[in-house]
Structures are given as C-alpha cells and as structure tokens.
C-alpha cells in the first residue's frame, strides 16, 4: 500500500495502485524512437535497441511499430499510455506479456504494431501466426 509518508498529491496521476493497493511500479521498455531496421520476412526480430528506459508513468506499456515502404524499413520502440491512441490506433493488446505484431491499415506502407506489459517486452517483436490469437486454429486449441 502507499506508505503514509508518501504524499498523495492532488490531481496526481503518478501514484497508481493495483488491486492489492500496492503502488504500481513503472515498466522498463526499449525506447529508441524510430530507427532503420533490417527486420523483414522473419517470424520474430530483436529490436537492436540498446536503450532501456523507465517509463515515465506507471500505467504506460511497451510499444513497437514496424513500418515498411518503398524506401526503407523502420522500427519504433517507445513507452505509451494504453488509454491513449498511438498512431491513431488503440493499444488493444497492452496486457499481453509478449509483443505480438498485428497489421494495421495505413495507406502507402505496411504497418504493424504491438504493445505489451512485461519488462523490455518490445525488444522481441513477434510476427509469427502461431502466436497470433486471431488465428482460429489457435483459439480452438485454447478453448478446448
């Protein structure tokens, strides 16, 4: 629980508690913003980002965005609040422990995004269908 000597200041979004009343500590995420990438046609890739940051707010999760156009491939790694859209998309998989890439519709490019909530989980980005719970066969296995 929040110790009594730690002030709960007014309008403070920095002190977040979980269901047990414990203070929610922030995520550690890869945070290199946008970098050129060689990740292409692979089941999974490492971010090759050497910067691990303490997310500024405890509610933030790790995010990775993979983009490919006619000129290059980039990988973006950041912390972001899942209550807010990122690149105009909701972070629907924010509670996942793994960063499972899902394709999003963006004109003129191939655009994949994932979010996750375990330490440095955006270091390993997964494209493989075997991890993707939108795969009907996998759903069948899960619910059997």
């Amino acid at each position: 629980t929040i110790p009594p000597h730690v002030q709960k200041s007014v309008n403070n979004d920095m002190i977040v508690t979980d269901n047990n009343g414990a203070v929610k500590f922030p995520q550690l995420c890869k945070f290199c913003d946008v970098r050129f990438s060689t990740c292409d046609n692979q089941k999974s890739c490492m971010s090759n980002c050497s910067i691990t940051s303490i997310c500024e707010k405890p509610q933030e999760v790790c995010v990775a965005v993979w983009r490919k156009n006619d000129e290059n491939i980039t990988l973006e790694t950041v912390c972001h609040d899942p209550k807010l859209p990122y690149h105009d998309f909701i972070l629907e998989d924010a509670a996942s422990p793994k960063c499972i890439m899902k394709e999003k519709k963006k004109p003129g490019e191939t655009f994949f995004m994932c979010s996750c909530s375990s330490d440095e989980c955006n270091d390993n980005i997964i494209f493989s269908e075997e991890y993707n719970t939108s795969n009907p066969d996998l759903l069948l296995v899960i619910f059997q």
Partner: nanobody
C-alpha cells in the same frame, strides 16, 4: 520485518554532489530489483533509477541520465545513489523501494535540497 533506511540527504549547492545510501534488512536482498524514487514538494512520484538483483543492469529516468549512478553492495545489503551535477529541480524526498508482483516496501525517505 522488511526495513529500508535511507541516509545521505542534505543541503547542497547547484552543481554539487551527494551520495544516498539505503540499508536494507528483513528480506533476501539479492532477490529483488531495487528502486530510487523521489517526490518533490506537492508533486507526484518520479521513478529515478532501478537496479537488477545482481547489479548487472541499471535503469534511469531521462531527467537524471548521465548525472546519477545507482549501485548496490549485496554483501552489505545496501543500495546507493551517487548524484552529481545537482540542479534545483532535483530537490525532493528520495525513497528507496523494493517491489515484487504483490507488495511494495518503502523507506522513510531522505530530503535532498539543492539551493544556493
């Protein structure tokens, strides 16, 4: 009983240095990631730095990168924060904290005041 006792705070001029110490007892120190967290007057918590159980990996908030260094001596159950190039905005109560999935433990804090 888990105890965390911070020391080393005080009044320092801008550009100066301080070393904070956190003495831990009542738990297996080598099991836990440890944190330094600060709270400026009337403000929220700011997560300053963290260190993994064996001290191999360290993490910093952007606001202190390159100025603060976290370390630990597992043989002495002690956590440290070396603070250099201190600024007025570093003025806060500094807490050491430990955390696992269910519980968090906090020290009473030590006040750092950076002022000329």
């Amino acid at each position: 009983e888990v105890q965390l006792l911070e020391s080393g705070g005080g009044l320092v001029q801008p550009g100066g240095s301080l070393r904070l110490t956190c003495a831990a007892s009542g738990f297996t120190f080598t099991d836990d990631r440890m944190w330094w967290v600060r709270q400026a007057p009337g403000k929220g918590l700011e997560w300053v730095s963290a260190i993994d159980p064996q001290g191999q990996h360290t993490y910093y908030a952007d606001s202190v990168k390159g100025r603060f260094t976290i370390s630990r001596d597992n043989s002495k159950n002690t956590l440290y924060l070396q603070m250099n190039s201190l600024r007025a905005e570093d003025t806060a109560v500094y807490y050491c904290a430990k955390h696992n999935s269910s519980f968090d433990y906090w020290g009473q804090g030590t006040l750092v005041t950076v002022s000329s």
